[in-house]
């Protein structure tokens, strides 16, 4: 989508590149903060964020965290760096190209999160990795 | 509220050259990275060129050499330099900073 392959001037400290070794551009990401959500028992949601932001800074990922408590339902979406802790978390799964959500124990609320590195990704938040299948005897034993 | 007014697009011949800007209001472009992203006529939004707030910058392979990108802090403004333009060159052209502001793109049609 945004250019496999980038070059950079040499006059920068901090050198980003992707898995080819080429410079990386800097990831575009739905950045809508917080919002309250409709997301509930769901395989997968749309996170309904209409901003798409580039990041502050080449090494930010898109980021994409689920809470329900006995009031509401949140999606917070999100730029962050993957080698600072999020919510106290490490983002485990910053390389993935999809937002495959995760729990995490937190009190007193549900709590997923996922991370991603390829552009508006968070914009298609999966809560099942089989979700994306093309097997419809597998979805058949999902759902039952 | 903050605005990115863009100018400078328009038809030129095989070879020739444009100088697209980027002027914002209601936000410090010195502070922000500023990126160019163009979208070709049937192809999906790609990255084009990229400015970070200390002046480093990053290019497309494809316009590498071609296109320069730069900054005027005094006038709250990021230029877009594309020389040697070719026809897939071709497409609008926008310019973004976060979080989240677009320009209202700007056409550029190569011949």
């Known amino acids: 989508t945004i250019p496999p392959h980038v070059q950079k001037s040499v006059n920068n400290d901090m050198i980003v590149t992707d898995n080819n070794g080429a410079v990386k551009f800097p990831q575009l990401c739905k950045f809508c903060d917080v919002r309250f959500s409709t997301c509930d028992n769901q395989k997968s949601c749309m996170s309904n964020c209409s901003i798409t932001s580039i990041c502050e800074k080449p090494q930010e990922v898109c980021v994409a965290v689920w809470r329900k408590n006995d009031e509401n339902i949140t999606l917070e979406t999100v730029c962050h760096d993957p080698k600072l802790p999020y919510h106290d978390f490490i983002l485990e799964d910053a390389a993935s190209p999809k937002c495959i959500m995760k729990e995490k124990k937190k009190p007193g609320e549900t709590f997923f999160m996922c991370s991603c590195s390829s552009d508006e990704c968070n914009d298609n938040i999966i809560f099942s990795e089989e979700y994306n299948t093309s097997n419809p005897d597998l979805l058949l034993v999902i759902f039952q | 509220q903050v605005q990115l007014q863009q100018s400078g697009g328009g038809l030129v011949q095989a070879g020739g050259s444009l100088r697209l800007s980027c002027a914002a209001s209601?936000?410090?472009?010195?502070?922000?990275?500023v990126a160019w992203y163009r979208q070709p006529p049937g192809k999906q939004r790609e990255g084009v060129a990229h400015i970070s707030s200390d002046g480093t910058t990053i290019y497309a392979d494809s316009v590498k050499g071609r296109f320069t990108v730069s900054r005027d802090n005094a006038k709250n403004t990021v230029y877009l330099e594309m020389n040697s333009l070719k026809p897939e060159d071709t497409g609008v052209y926008y310019c973004?900073?976060?979080?989240?502001?677009w320009g209202q793109g700007t056409q550029v049609t190569v011949s």
């Open positions: 209601g936000i410090t472009f010195s502070t922000k990275p």
């Open positions: 973004t900073a976060p979080v989240g502001y």
